[in-house]
Each structure stands twice: as C-alpha cells, then as structure tokens.
C-alpha cells in the first residue's frame, strides 16, 4: 500500500522538515528559514510562531516543530497552546474588566488566576465551621455540632490506670 501511495503521490515521501515543492516538479525541499513542517507529506511549511510582547519563548522553533510560548512574569497562559496571556492577580482577588478586585465576602481565591468561589457551606454536610474562611482561604469544616455537645463525644476516654494488687476504692 505504501509503495502504491508513493507512486500516486510523490509528496507522501516528503519527511518532516520538508515540503512538496510545486515549483520544483513536486520534489521534497527543506523548509525555508523560520518555517517548519512537523509531519511528512506537507505541501507547505508553516511559519514559525513568534513569542513577542507579553509572550516569551519556552521552546525555539525548528524546521520540524513550532515554537512554544508561555507568558512573562505577572501573566499566565490561557487557551490551547497558550494562545493568550492573562494578567495575574493576588490571592484573594479575581480579574475583572476593571482589573484585579478583592473577593466579595463569602468567597475566596487561593490562586493568582481564576475567579473567586463561594466558601464551602459546612452545614450542607451536617458539619460546623472549624476555621473561618478568608478572601484567600476556604472555610475548614469540622465535626457536626451534635458531635461537639457535652457527653456526646465519639472518643471514649481511657479508663483510669489501676495498680495491680489493689481493689478499686
């Protein structure tokens, strides 16, 4: 099958890093500078991505693979292949159209990206709040209020130690 295919389409023999050059009677030609083909059988080489401005180069372009970008400090990647860079905020904030804003009461964000999320509602699980939430941290839920009522402890205290040979007083 491979042999049949290559007889029908000479371009199928062109390896990665080359393209099938119509200007040269469909012979394989190496990709021109600053372009690449990552698979065989390509009819053109793609222009290398350039990481400019808020983007910085994570991996240089080669004749067989595109450049990879990430974001400069203070920004983070969004989208497939880091197609966008979004401004970081502090923990306890979220990015809005007007910039970084503190989380509203009852919400938190423990990262430099993303949105503020509501504190966990401990009572939905029948638990109580052990540690209060902040803008940066979620609440910590503890045992249920019933578990904390006097005489209802689930942990049985150890019996008092007795010396051998003595009867209890």
């Amino acid at each position: 099958f491979e042999r049949t295919r290559s007889l029908q389409d000479p371009c199928s023999n062109c390896p990665a890093g080359t393209f099938c050059d119509n200007n040269r009677n469909q012979i394989c030609s190496p990709c021109p500078p600053n372009s690449f083909s990552s698979a065989g059988g390509q009819r053109t080489c793609d222009i290398c991505r350039q990481c400019k401005g808020v983007f910085r180069t994570r991996k240089e372009c080669s004749s067989t693979s595109n450049a990879e970008c990430d974001c400069t400090p203070g920004f983070h990647c969004l989208g497939a292949g880091c197609s966008m860079c979004e401004q970081d905020c502090k923990q306890g904030q979220e990015l809005t159209k007007k910039g970084c804003k503190d989380c509203c009461f009852g919400t938190f964000n423990d990262q430099k990206r993303g949105i503020c999320r509501p504190w966990t509602n401990c009572s939905l699980d029948g638990k109580s709040v052990l540690v209060n939430g902040t803008k940066e941290r979620d609440v910590v839920c503890g045992p249920s209020p019933a578990d904390l009522s006097p005489g209802a402890s689930s942990v049985t205290p150890p019996a008092p130690a007795r010396e051998p040979g003595h009867s209890p007083q």
């Epitope: 890093g17 190496p30 990709c31 021109p32 500078p33 600053n34 240089e60 372009c61 080669s62 004749s63 067989t64």
Partner: nanobody
C-alpha cells in the same frame, strides 16, 4: 548569486564509500539551508540529506545510517560522506543552496 561546484563522484563497488564535496563561491553568508539531492536515470530528482535553517542535519530514509552531511564554513564547502553504497545509489548527485544548483557529480555503484 551563489555558484556551486560538486566533485568526488566516481565508480565504486557495492559496500564501498565515497565523499562528495560541494565548493561554494559568492555571498553564501545569508544562506541557511544546504542540501544534497540525487537523480537516478529515468527518475525524478530526490532529496537525500540537508542542513535545515536551524543547523540540524536531516536525512531521508534512503540515506539514514549510511550517509553523513557536514560542512566547513571556513572552506565554504559542503560534504556528503556515503558509506555502504548500494546499486540503487547510482545517480547524479547535486548540491543545492536554497535557489542555486551545482552541475552535479556522477556516482556509479557497480560490481
């Protein structure tokens, strides 16, 4: 324009070796892609080995493991070391620098 002149071809037995040279003259300093092609009788010209613009050497399947491309920038010369030659390596071998071609050098592998 760049002028290219190949040399080093000849008659060799199967399993033998040859080293082709391609001497370049003219303004070669802006050229970043250097290649060796070959054309067997009655067949289309085909790529054999090349230095890509990122300075990495590449080979087509027919050349992998047997041929080695190299260059000497001070001598403005591109080389193709060909080992373990086979009958099917018989062809005219051409040097290419982006838009310029040499006149070719004949390689004949025959017992």
């Amino acid at each position: 324009a760049v002028q290219l002149v190949e040399s080093g071809g000849g008659l060799v037995q199967p399993g033998g070796s040859l080293r082709l040279s391609c001497a370049a003259s003219g303004n070669i300093f802006s050229i970043r892609v250097w290649s060796w092609y070959r054309q067997a009788p009655g067949k289309q010209r085909e790529l054999v080995a090349w230095f890509a613009w990122d300075n990495i050497a590449h080979y087509t399947d027919s050349a992998k493991g047997r041929f080695a491309i190299s260059r000497d920038n001070t001598k403005k010369t591109l080389y193709l070391q060909m080992n373990s030659l086979k009958l099917e390596d018989t062809a005219v071998y051409y040097c290419n620098s982006e838009d310029s071609w040499g006149q070719g050098t004949q390689v004949t592998v025959s017992s």
